[in-house]
Amino acid sequence: TLNSVLINSNAIKNLPPPLGGAGGQPGSAVSVAPGVLYEGGNKYQTLDNYQPYPCAEDEECGSDEYCSSPSRGAAGVGGVQICLACRKRRKRCMRHAMCCPGNYCKNGICMPSDHSHFPRGEIEESIIENLGNDHNAAAGDGYPRRTTLTSKIYHTKGQEGSVCLRSSDCAAGLCCARHFWSKICKPVLKEGQVCTKHKRKGSHGLEIFQRCYCGEGLACRIQKDHHQASNSSRLHTCQRH
């Protein structure tokens, strides 16, 4: 499954297309792959119309989920399994994947893992959580891999495209923003460049591609000459106040 990067505590993952439905309709919760919320025409989808994601194995679900039938015991209707929320510490489990990151399944109970150097919820800005990547952690350990960024690369300010943790790691005129599988230094936006208009507080953590903010004296507004039927699919650009 697609790599998912934990950006901050506001990150909401696994907002998939409805069962049997095609993704991409405006106003629906859309995910191009388990674990990744995507930006459809600059319209950020929210939990308001959450739909379960069908799956065959745990790997198809996000870090905070596991694959199982929705009803206890027997498989769901027609044997359908969906991604279910992971189980917290001290909850019952049958395998590691059922437990939330930082925990593992021991004697049927989710227990804290010794491998988890960063307690969940702490210093989340300082880790990149790689899910479903091709370079697997030790087989069967049941934990998402967490990789910290090497401190030695921060002696000089990051140039465009270099990895970063926060904007202060980047050179002037750049900000630290998510770019598919990583966070890199990107240029602050200039007039006319595509920007992202966030519909609600905290939504910046949802994007698989983050853009920097518009530069001084500019605001992110709907492109005036962008004639499209639906407001939701219009591009926003940085425009003079």
Partner: antibody, heavy 118, light 112 residues
Framework: QVQLVESGGGLVQPGGSLRLSCAAS????????MSWVRQAPGKGLEWVSV??????????YYAASVKGRFTISRDNSKNTLYLQMNSLRAEDTAVYYC?????????WGQGTLVTVSS | DIALTQPASVSGSPGQSITISCTGT?????????VSWYQQHPGKAPKLMIY???NRPSGVSNRFSGSKSGNTASLTISGLQAEDEADYYC???????????FGGGTKLTVLG
């Protein structure tokens, strides 16, 4: 300035192996993800693999067409990117480019030709 | 197999404007407001011309511009010049196994 120089290409028989290298200079190599992209003769570009900035235990991704046969790696102390290619097939014949994956493929090498033929 | 669809060729006269289209699906190009364009002259390495839909890297002429609507992205070159004659490739990201996808390429011919 940023420079990427590939080497290691050549003629190899089907089923054989080859290891490509890419020497990087002019930028902080250890701060960038790096990729391999290939181009079959007269054809378009095809992404092959990408590796995280870290050289030990870093994340890697592969195109479905090479997964299980190719291995990407890097040595940050030598500013070098590698591509180990095993079980080569005729369809792997291409110019292999090493590319810096900053904001997309912002710098490319000149490429090295790999020919798989009996 | 090509994930993004581009016209095989386009042509224009010096001074004219041309547009190259790139069509994908909701799983790749349509799924993200994100696309890049590369220029490749014969026997040379590709060069990044546009990223993030319509952003130009430093050193790229402002005659090159990008846009995107739905599942289709476009590269427009205004004031065509002889040196613009090259192959152009779009690139996006995708869900599933292949994380990076390219278009099949478009050969731009500058007439005259």
């Amino acid at each position: 300035q940023v420079q990427l120089v590939e080497s290691g290409g050549g003629l190899v028989q089907p089923g054989g192996s080859l290891r490509l290298s890419c020497a990087a200079s002019g930028f902080t190599f250890s701060s960038y993800w790096m990729s391999w992209v290939r181009q079959a003769p007269g054809k378009g570009l095809e992404w092959v693999s990408v590796i995280e900035h870290k050289d030990k235990g870093g994340t890697t991704y592969y195109a479905a067409s090479v997964k299980g046969r190719f291995t990407i790696s890097r040595d940050n102390s030598k500013n070098t990117l590698y591509l180990q290619m095993n079980s080569l097939r005729a369809e792997d014949t291409a110019v292999y480019y090493c590319a810096r994956h900053g904001i997309d493929f912002d710098h490319w090498g000149q490429g090295t030709l790999v020919t798989v033929s009996s | 197999d090509i994930a993004l669809t581009q016209p095989a060729s386009v042509s224009g006269s010096p001074g004219q404007s041309i547009t190259i289209s790139c069509t994908g699906t909701s799983s790749d190009l349509g799924g993200y407001n994100y696309v890049s364009w590369y220029q490749q002259h014969p026997g040379k390495a590709p060069k990044l011309m546009i990223y993030d839909v319509n952003n130009r890297p430093s050193g790229v002429s402002n005659r090159f511009s990008g846009s995107k609507s739905g599942n289709t992205a476009s590269l427009t070159i205004s004031g065509l010049q002889a040196e613009d004659e090259a192959d152009y490739y779009c690139q996006s990201y995708a869900s599933g196994n292949t994380k990076v996808v390219f278009g099949g390429g478009t050969k731009l011919t500058v007439l005259g």
